[in-house]
Interface confidence: medium
């Protein structure tokens, strides 16, 4: 596969991953709680997320309440908020860096500097995935640990929510996409040394492996 094709595939995966990460961040199903005790007969399930908690009635009606105070939130929720939002914002930055370094755009000159810009975009997406993975795994670890902890009453046991699975899928896409973007700029077209300083200006765009690419001709 040519480096341009790798870049396009990588960018598509990263964009899908980014969308998935935003979805995971917004959804209330980070942990779910089902309990049919006497005092909540009408409740079918409870969801807890980073921004709100929801109760789903047996009728299918869902009522959600946004968390009032940040200070009242648990440490893991606060940390998960900060890290997930950081990952979403970093992915936004990575998008522009990747587009600047992409072979089909014209904002950076085609030479070696452009390869390093593209490589930076890939690395940012890779880091993005890792950054988002931290709160997801941390949250999941707490849920699983409490689920198997005999000292935690049944009425307080939660299960892993859909948002965590969506988040994991998103981080996988971000990391795979980031790797493909790095490949497009690195493996396929000369493998620039990451530590090598860029010593020249840059205006422009490329086709790294496209020796006699038909689109170049009149």
């Amino acid at each position: 596969m040519g480096s341009a094709a790798l870049e396009i595939l990588g960018l598509v995966l990263c964009l899908v991953g980014w969308g998935g990460l935003i979805l995971a961040c917004a959804l209330p199903q980070w942990r779910i709680y089902s309990y049919a005790g006497d005092n909540i007969v009408t409740a079918q399930a409870m969801y807890e997320g980073l921004w709100m908690s929801c109760v789903v009635q047996s009728t299918g009606h869902m009522q959600c309440k946004v968390y009032d105070s940040v200070l009242a939130l648990s440490t893991e929720v606060q940390a998960a908020r900060a890290l997930t939002v950081s990952a979403v914002l970093l992915a936004f930055v990575a998008l522009f860096v990747t587009l600047a370094g992409a072979q089909c755009t014209t904002c950076v000159a085609p030479g070696p500097a452009k390869a390093r810009v593209a490589l930076t975009g890939g690395v940012l997406y890779l880091f993005c995935g890792l950054l988002a993975l931290v709160p997801l795994c941390w949250f999941a670890n707490i849920v699983v640990r409490e689920f198997y902890d005999p000292s935690v009453p049944v009425s307080q046991k939660y299960e892993l929510g859909a948002a965590l699975y969506i988040g994991w899928a998103a981080t996988a896409l971000l990391m795979v996409g980031g790797c493909l973007l790095c490949c497009g700029a690195w493996v396929c077209t000369g493998r620039p040394d990451l530590s090598f300083p860029v010593k020249y200006s840059a205006p422009r765009r490329p086709t790294a492996t496209g020796d006699y690419d038909k689109k170049n001709y009149v």
Epitope: S3, Q103, T106, A109, P110, G111, P112, A113, K114, A115, A118, A185, T189, G190, R191, P192, D193, F196, K199, Y200, A202, P203, R204, R205, P206, T207, A208, T209, G210, D211, Y212, D213, K215, N216, Y217, V218
Partner: antibody
């Protein structure tokens, strides 16, 4: 069929300005970059500069202060202007297609034009 | 600037034998090296790009190898038409630079 052809004066007076034209056929300058390379008699090749497909330019530091590369996309021509010429600037001047890759090379070359700087 | 040193400066060969031309970079440039052939009174012609990638319309007897600082252009079974000067060029960083060339002579 891709072709590049250089044209310009064969003789230039010292301290004067050299103007060369590279006429490109079979390629669109909107999608292709063009470099200028020179070769003094009996010596090696020296990359002078490039005009990228988006119109941006890069120059070799050895000639940066004296060199200007421009283009006319409607005529599919690339121009080289080099001022303050000295006898050591006498060389064969080539224009070459430079694929817009991360690591540029030259896959199509003109036949070259010999420029002699002499009074 | 990255300096490319080609050796030997001149190489005498008999038709049919295989030869290796060397190009050494002043710093690691990965595989960002390209090889050209220039016959007398002609413009250069691209032979190999990115150290080892062959170019269409170029005879298969020309091959390239190497990575980092040391690169080699190999001609398997030299023919009389291969009498030329061979240049390596780096594109790892601007300015793009060429080696001083290796002149291939036929004995």
């Amino acid at each position: 069929q891709v072709q590049l052809k250089e044209s310009g004066p064969g003789l230039v007076q010292p301290s004067q300005t050299l103007s060369l034209t590279c006429t490109v056929s079979g390629l669109s300058l909107i999608r292709n970059s063009v470099s200028w390379i020179r070769q003094p008699p009996g010596k090696g090749l020296e990359w002078m500069g490039v005009i990228w497909s988006n119109g941006g330019t890069e120059y070799n530091s050895t000639v940066k202060s004296r060199l200007s590369i421009s283009r006319d996309t409607s005529k599919n021509q690339v121009f080289l202007k080099m001022n303050s010429l000295q006898t050591e600037d006498s060389a064969m001047f080539f224009c070459a297609r430079t694929p817009d890759g991360y690591y540029p090379y030259f896959d199509y070359w003109g036949q070259g034009v010999m420029v002699t700087v002499s009074s | 600037d990255i300096v490319l040193t080609q050796s030997p400066a001149t190489l005498s060969v008999t038709p049919g034998e295989s030869v290796s031309l060397s190009c050494r970079a002043s710093q690691g440039i990965s595989t960002s090296i390209h090889w050209y052939q220039q016959k007398s009174n002609e413009s250069p012609r691209l032979l190999i790009r990115y150290a080892s990638q062959s170019i269409s319309r170029i005879p298969s007897r020309f091959s390239g190898s190497g990575s980092g600082t040391d690169f080699t252009l190999t001609i398997n079974g030299v023919e009389s038409e291969d009498l030329s000067v061979y240049y390596c060029q780096q594109s790892y960083n601007l300015p793009l630079t060429f080696g001083s060339g290796t002149k291939l002579e036929i004995k």
